[in-house]
Interface confidence: low
């Protein structure tokens, strides 16, 4: 009964009924990706074209819950995966110590209000080391050339900008520290030991509506999707788990 609101469900989630009206948002993902056995990979999804508020993001593999990033409670990593899954960056997920068995479909499930649920799909193929290395041989020279070119261009741009702004005594504050600040408690949370609000979200190219006023901080504004929709008190029965 993933909750009778699709309620209880989610795993977790598990989904509240969608509000009426069109779901205009779209999920952009990294698509089909490959990685080397034993290595790491970052799974990333991005919700755009909607002003809906993101309240929780679930990461799942096939039918297994990997992790949940809840706006209020932060990250929860499923006990079965906590040794090999790390939260972030942002709303993404990092898979470590990859094995061939990790090959398969991964889903990012965005719980939003009032739109409901958006799901993105990523297919990961974990390659044997020799295969990955073979592909890398062809990429390294090209990447090296591109990097060298970029360094030259960037240096020139920096010099020009520096000379242009030299006369201005304006002090420009960098927001980089805010954007990259890792908030405390990016570990699994439970009812008994919640991590700080919004610890899972950093405003790194965050879509509109995700972090309220886009302050470059954690997204504590994400309200619990379930509470808002009376999901956790609530909406669909299967919500207790999550809807399909």
């Amino acid at each position: 009964m993933r909750w009778c609101l699709l309620l209880i469900w989610a795993q977790g989630l598990r989904q509240a009924p969608l509000a009426s009206g069109m779901m205009t948002g779209t999920i952009e993902t990294t698509g089909n990706i490959s990685a080397e056995k034993g290595g790491s990979i970052i799974l990333q999804c991005h919700l755009s074209s909607t002003t809906a508020q993101v309240t929780q993001v679930n990461w799942e593999q096939q039918d297994q819950l990997l992790a949940i990033c809840n706006a209020d409670l932060g990250w929860h990593i499923s006990p079965s995966f906590k040794d090999r899954v790390a939260p972030g960056p942002g709303l993404g997920l990092t898979l470590q110590s990859l094995t061939v068995n990790d090959t398969g479909e991964y889903f990012c499930i965005y719980h939003t209000y009032p739109d409901g649920t958006y799901t993105g799909r990523i297919f990961l193929e974990v390659l044997e080391s020799s295969v990955a290395e073979h592909g890398a041989r062809f990429q390294i020279p090209l990447l090296g050339a591109m990097a060298a070119t970029l360094v030259v261009i960037c240096t020139a741009v920096i010099v020009v900008v520096a000379l242009t702004r030299k006369k201005k005594a304006l002090r420009i504050h960098s927001v980089e520290g805010d954007l990259r600040r890792k908030s405390a408690g990016q570990e699994e949370w439970s009812p008994s030991a919640p991590s700080p609000p919004g610890s899972c979200v950093q405003a790194e190219a965050a879509p509109a509506g995700l972090c309220g006023e886009q302050r470059g901080e954690d997204c504590a504004e994400l309200h619990d999707y379930f509470n808002v929709l009376s999901y956790r008190s609530l909406g669909n029965c299967s919500f207790f788990t999550e809807t399909g």
């Epitope: 799942e60 009812p191 029965c237």
Partner: antibody
Framework: EVQLVESGGGLVQPGRSLRLSCAAS????????MHWVRQAPGKGLEWVSG????????GYADSVKGRFTISRDNAKNSLYLQMNSLRAEDTALYYC??????????????WGQGTTVTVSS | DIVMTQSPLSLPVTPGEPASISCRSS???????????LDWYLQKPGQSPQLLIY???NRASGVPDRFSGSGSGTDFTLKISRVEAEDVGVYYC?????????FGQGTKLEIK
């Protein structure tokens, strides 16, 4: 083996309280939503309450709202149902149940054997 | 609240013959994600209920393929292609779309 074992049922007078417990084993308890479903003698099934894996989402049937409280202790792999202000119509066999999935909805795939609650003066 | 109505309430069947149970909801159980949030459960005499079908038409693990679920929106059907003696019991449909979840009254299947 996946198992749910209910306890705490018994005979109680109207207006009194009772606390049901459900001990879960054989699966990762804190990955799944749980529910209580009851069945009055000779009657059909009635969903009573549900709770998400992280206790954030909670739902109740109208007939028990304000009187019953569902909770869980993931560290103890346990589900609870605190029943206050009991009425004769709460007399039933109470089942502890588990959601079948944690991404999509897969129905309620595991049911305990139930514990009997009798409310009578 | 969503009200679930089953018919018939009693269903005598000859072993080997097909059986069909209808379940109707007071409002659509079709979620915008394309799934119908309707399950079927069987409670055999003296036992706890067991899941047969979830999301309208998906057979639960271990359920014989003679059981099938169909329908969408407000009208659903559970079919047993060839009834066996072990299929005796009360069949319930349950909506999982909105809280509170709700069950039908149950259909008692008995062998003629």
């Amino acid at each position: 083996e996946v198992q749910l074992v209910e306890s705490g049922g018994g005979l109680v007078q109207p207006g009194r309280s009772l606390r049901l417990s459900c001990a879960a084993s054989g699966f990762t308890f804190d990955d799944y939503a749980m529910h209580w479903v009851r069945q009055a003698p000779g009657k059909g099934l009635e969903w009573v309450s549900g709770i998400s894996w992280n206790s954030i989402t909670i739902g109740y049937a109208d007939s028990v709202k304000g009187r019953f409280t569902i909770s869980r202790d993931n560290a103890k792999n346990s589900l609870y149902l605190q029943m206050n202000s009991l009425r004769a119509e709460d007399t039933a066999l109470y089942y502890c149940t588990k959601d079948g999935g944690n991404r999509r909805y897969y129905g309620v795939d595991v049911w305990g054997q139930g514990t009997t609650v009798t409310v009578s003066s | 609240d969503i009200v679930m109505t089953q018919s018939p309430l009693s269903l005598p069947v000859t072993p080997g013959e097909p059986a069909s149970i209808s379940c109707r909801s007071s409002q659509s159980l079709l979620h915008s994600n394309g799934y119908n949030y309707l399950d079927w459960y069987l409670q055999k005499p003296g036992q706890s209920p067991q899941l047969l079908i979830y999301l309208g038409s998906n057979r639960a693990s271990g359920v014989p393929d003679r059981f099938s679920g169909s329908g969408s929106g407000t009208d659903f059907t559970l079919k047993i292609s060839r009834v066996e003696a072990e299929d005796v019991g009360v069949y319930y449909c349950m909506q999982a779309l909105q809280t509170p979840c709700s069950f039908g009254q149950g259909t008692k299947l008995e062998i003629k």
